[in-house]
């Protein structure tokens, strides 16, 4: 299973669910829906409110039983790390792939954890990351901005991840904008 | 008491296919993801294949990957495995089993496939 | 072919005990309480003998037990008799392979 890691902006819009939790058990396999259930203690949800209603404490995230599939495998086995968790909802369940945003958070940026607490939210409704995966591209839309951090190293290690974004400068026309200048 | 039939083995061409049934009975069916396991003659047991209670997920060896598909069809308490661009080494006694990659609880008697020109 | 380590055989004489191994790494036995050890008699199907490593189903004798320790689990037969003759296979799930089994242990009932 490979995929290429979002910009994390499009992880937050495109989940259903952006938490902050320990994982804190040993996975567990259903042996009727074949899927692997991590135990987390949540800490922080950041999206998510309303698609949960009242039942607004996870307690497991699912994935495939096998990585072929894109099952996501926890390789951490400190219960103390907090992780930044970015799925998808199916059956009221938090179901999370080898392709989910998930990442401690003390390895994101000052700029991206402000992103994930107040910022992306911002851009998710008008604005678009547009990976630019080979030179030349070009911007289909005002909307759209252009993702270069793949075609000078690690997407996820690059500039644009780690410290902009693509929010709403006029109605029509989104622009990187440094996560830094917003307000804490 | 639960019972599983596998059936459709047989004779068959390299490059060839087979559909392969398991009928179960004895139990609810669709509460238990269920597996195809097989032997080649004189050799060791091979997992290849599971499939979740509902049908929505599926898993392969690497070995059958591309070539092999499980279904199962919760009305008919079945369970199948179609098998395209058979080879030589898939010749075995295949068997289905209750459940996924582990805890095997009830087997088929097996049904042979010989691969072969 | 990804299999989990058996000793091809072993023996062992009427009322006496023996131990079956089975290795693995970390990715399988080490890292899942999901081992399963099954028996199969010459030409019938394989039998559930202990699941969830130390689990025994209904109906299976408490003279067959399971442990675990790291990356080896071990199958135990107590008070050997002639019907414990046959193949005896050990099973892991992995997250890499999805299941994997030993390569099977004759175990030979003397005299």
């Known amino acids: 299973c490979t995929c290429v890691p979002p910009h994390p902006q499009t992880a937050f819009c495109n989940s259903d669910l952006v938490i902050r939790a320990k994982f804190v058990g040993t996975p567990e396999v259903n042996q009727t829906t074949l899927y692997q259930r991590y135990e987390i203690k949540m800490t922080k949800m950041y999206k998510g409110f309303q698609a949960l209603g009242d039942a607004a404490d996870i307690r497991f995230v699912y994935t495939p039983a096998m990585e072929s599939v894109c099952g996501y495998f926890h390789r951490s086995h400190n219960r103390s790390e907090e992780f930044l968790i970015a799925g998808k909802l199916q059956d009221g369940l938090l179901h999370i792939t080898t392709c989910s945003f998930v990442a401690p958070w003390n390895s994101l940026s000052l700029a991206q954890r402000r992103g994930f607490t107040k910022t992306y939210t911002v851009g998710c409704e008008e604005c678009t990351v547009f990976p630019c995966l080979s030179i030349p591209c070009k911007l289909q839309s005002g909307t759209h901005c252009l993702w270069t951090d793949q075609l000078l190293q690690g997407s996820e290690k690059g500039f644009q991840s780690r410290h902009l974004a693509c929010l709403p400068r006029e109605p029509g026309l989104c622009t990187w904008q440094s996560l830094r200048s917003q307000i804490a | 008491q639960v019972q599983l039939v596998e059936s459709g083995g047989g004779l068959v061409q390299p490059g060839g296919s087979l559909r392969l049934s398991c009928a179960a009975s004895g139990f609810t069916f669709s509460s238990y993801a269920m597996s195809w396991v097989r032997q080649a003659p004189g050799k060791g047991l091979e997992w290849v294949s599971a499939i979740s209670g509902s049908g929505g997920s599926t898993y392969y060896a690497d070995s059958v990957k591309g070539r092999f598909t499980i279904s199962r069809d919760n009305s008919k308490n079945t369970l199948y495995l179609q098998m395209n661009s058979l080879r030589a080494e898939d010749t075995a006694v295949y068997y289905c089993a209750r459940g996924g990659f582990f805890n095997m609880d009830y087997w088929g008697q097996g049904t042979l496939v010989t691969v072969s020109s | 072919d990804i299999a989990l380590t058996q000793p091809a055989s072993v023996s062992g004489s009427p009322g006496q005990s023996i131990t079956i191994s089975c290795t693995g790494t970390?990715?399988?036995?080490?890292?899942?309480?999901?081992v399963s050890w099954y028996q199969q008699h010459p030409g019938k199907a394989p039998k559930l003998m202990i699941y969830d490593v130390s689990n025994r189903p209904s109906g299976v004798s408490n003279r067959f037990s399971g442990s675990k320790s790291g990356n080896t689990a071990s199958l135990t037969i107590s008070g050997l008799q002639a019907e414990d003759e046959a193949d005896y296979y050990c099973q892991s799930y992995d997250f890499t392979y999805g299941s994997v089994f030993g390569g099977g242990t004759k175990l030979t009932v003397l005299g």
């Open positions: 970390s990715s399988d036995v080490g890292g899942y309480n999901y």
